[in-house]
C-alpha cells in the first residue's frame, strides 16, 4: 500500500489537500521524494475508484496512517520500493 | 522500449463481432496505475475513445459505445482485446490501442500509440 | 460528455510563420490546479503522438518550437516557427471526466 515512487515527470501536485481520505477508499499511497525535477516531496493518495488526491505532507493524518502502515510492513516485509520510471 | 502492435481481421461483415487484440512490449500490464485501451478514427473524421482496463481490470467504456463493447486483457501475454458487436458501416475506421501515462489514474491521457489496423465493415 | 471545440477546423500557413490553435471545452477541464488538457499531431497515414500534457508540459523529445497554454475551457497550442515536418493535423483531448473526448482537430497545410 506504501510506495517509494521514482518518477521522470516533474511535479505531479499543484495543490495540496489536508482533507481526511477513509482507509477504505485508499488502493495505495505514492511517495515522491523531493528531486527529479520537483523540489517537494509529494504524496499521492490513489482512490479505489482510481481519482488520485495530492495530499499535503504535514497532514496529521497522512502522517499516522504513513506510521501505522510502516510498523505493520516492518513487522512482516520491508516497505516496498518501486524505483519505477514510467518512460 | 514502450511498443504496442494491433492485430485482427481487416474486413468484418455487418451485424457481426469485430474482435482486435494489442500485443505490448517494454512494459507490464499488471504494473499499479497502468491502463491501455482503444481509440477509433474513421475515415477523413477525428478520433474517439472507445475504452480502456485499468491494471486492476476495471473497465471504463465510452457510454455511445457501451453496449456493443467489451475490453480485457490477459497478462500473461502481453496483450488486451477489444471486441464490437453488431457492427455495422459506421464502425469502419482505424482502430488505435494506446496505452496511458501512468501518472493520474482516471484523469490520465495517451502517451503510447500502436500503429493502428484498418477496419472496414461491408458485405 | 464535455465537448471539444477546435479552431480553425484548417489552416494554411507557411515555414517560419507562428501559428496558434485554440480548443474550448464545453465545461472546466480543471481539478485541483492542473489542466488535464493534452494535445496530439497526426501526420496522414500515421497514429496520433502525444505533444503536450496537462496543458502545457512538453512531452520528452518534442522540439520546443511547441507550446501550450490555458485554463479552465480555453487552451492554445502554438508554434512559434512552422517547420516542414509541422504540417499535420493537431487534436486536442480532455481526461478531466469520462468519456475522455477530443476535439475535431485542426488541419495545418502549407501555403
Known amino acids: 500500500v506504501l510506495e517509494v515512487y521514482y518518477t521522470s515527470l516533474r511535479c505531479r501536485c499543484v495543490q495540496e489537500s489536508s482533507v481526511f481520505i477513509p482507509r477504505r477508499f485508499i488502493d495505495r499511497i505514492q511517495i515522491l521524494p523531493r528531486g527529479n525535477g520537483c523540489p517537494r516531496k509529494e504524496i499521492i493518495v490513489w482512490k479505489k475508484n482510481k481519482s488520485i488526491v495530492c495530499v499535503d505532507p504535514q497532514a496529521e493524518w497522512i502522517q499516522r496512517m504513513m506510521e501505522v502502515l510502516r510498523k505493520r510492513s516492518s513487522s512482516t516485509l520491508p516497505v516496498p520500493v518501486f524505483k519505477r520510471k514510467i518512460p | 522500449q514502450v511498443q504496442l502492435q494491433e492485430s485482427g481481421p481487416g474486413l468484418v461483415k455487418p451485424s457481426e463481432t469485430l474482435s482486435l487484440t494489442c500485443t505490448v512490449s517494454?512494459?507490464?500490464?499488471?504494473?499499479?496505475?497502468?491502463?491501455v485501451g482503444w481509440i477509433r478514427q474513421p475515415p477523413g473524421k477525428g478520433l474517439e475513445w472507445i475504452a480502456h482496463?485499468?491494471?486492476?481490470?476495471?473497465?471504463r467504456y465510452n457510454p455511445a459505445l457501451k453496449s456493443r463493447v467489451t475490453i480485457s486483457k490477459d497478462t500473461s501475454k502481453n496483450q488486451f482485446s477489444l471486441k464490437l458487436s453488431s457492427v455495422t458501416a459506421a464502425d469502419t475506421a482505424v482502430y488505435y490501442c494506446?496505452?496511458?501515462?501512468?501518472?493520474?489514474?482516471?484523469?490520465?491521457?495517451?502517451?503510447?500509440w500502436g500503429q493502428g489496423t484498418t477496419v472496414t465493415v461491408s458485405s | 460528455d464535455i465537448q471539444m471545440t477546435q479552431s480553425p477546423s484548417s489552416l494554411s500557413a507557411s515555414v517560419g510563420d507562428r501559428v496558434t490553435i485554440t480548443c474550448r471545452a464545453s465545461?472546466?477541464?480543471?481539478?485541483?490546479?492542473?489542466?488535464?488538457m493534452h494535445w496530439y499531431q497526426q501526420k496522414p497515414g500515421k497514429a496520433p503522438k502525444l505533444l503536450i500534457f496537462?496543458?502545457?508540459d512538453l512531452e520528452s523529445g518534442v522540439p520546443s518550437g511547441f507550446s501550450g497554454s490555458g485554463s479552465r475551457t480555453d487552451f492554445t497550442l502554438t508554434i512559434s516557427s512552422l517547420q516542414p515536418e509541422d504540417f499535420a493535423t493537431y487534436y486536442c483531448?480532455?481526461?478531466?471526466?469520462?468519456?475522455?473526448?477530443f476535439g475535431q482537430g485542426t488541419k495545418l497545410e502549407i501555403k
Open positions: 494506446a496505452r496511458i501515462a501512468g501518472y493520474y489514474g482516471s484523469r490520465d491521457w495517451f502517451a503510447y
Open positions: 517494454g512494459f507490464s500490464l499488471s504494473t499499479f496505475g497502468m491502463g
Open positions: 482496463i485499468w491494471w486492476d481490470d476495471d473497465r
Open positions: 465545461e472546466s477541464v480543471d481539478n485541483s490546479g492542473i489542466s488535464f
Open positions: 496537462r496543458a502545457s
Open positions: 483531448q480532455q481526461s478531466n471526466k469520462d468519456p475522455w473526448t
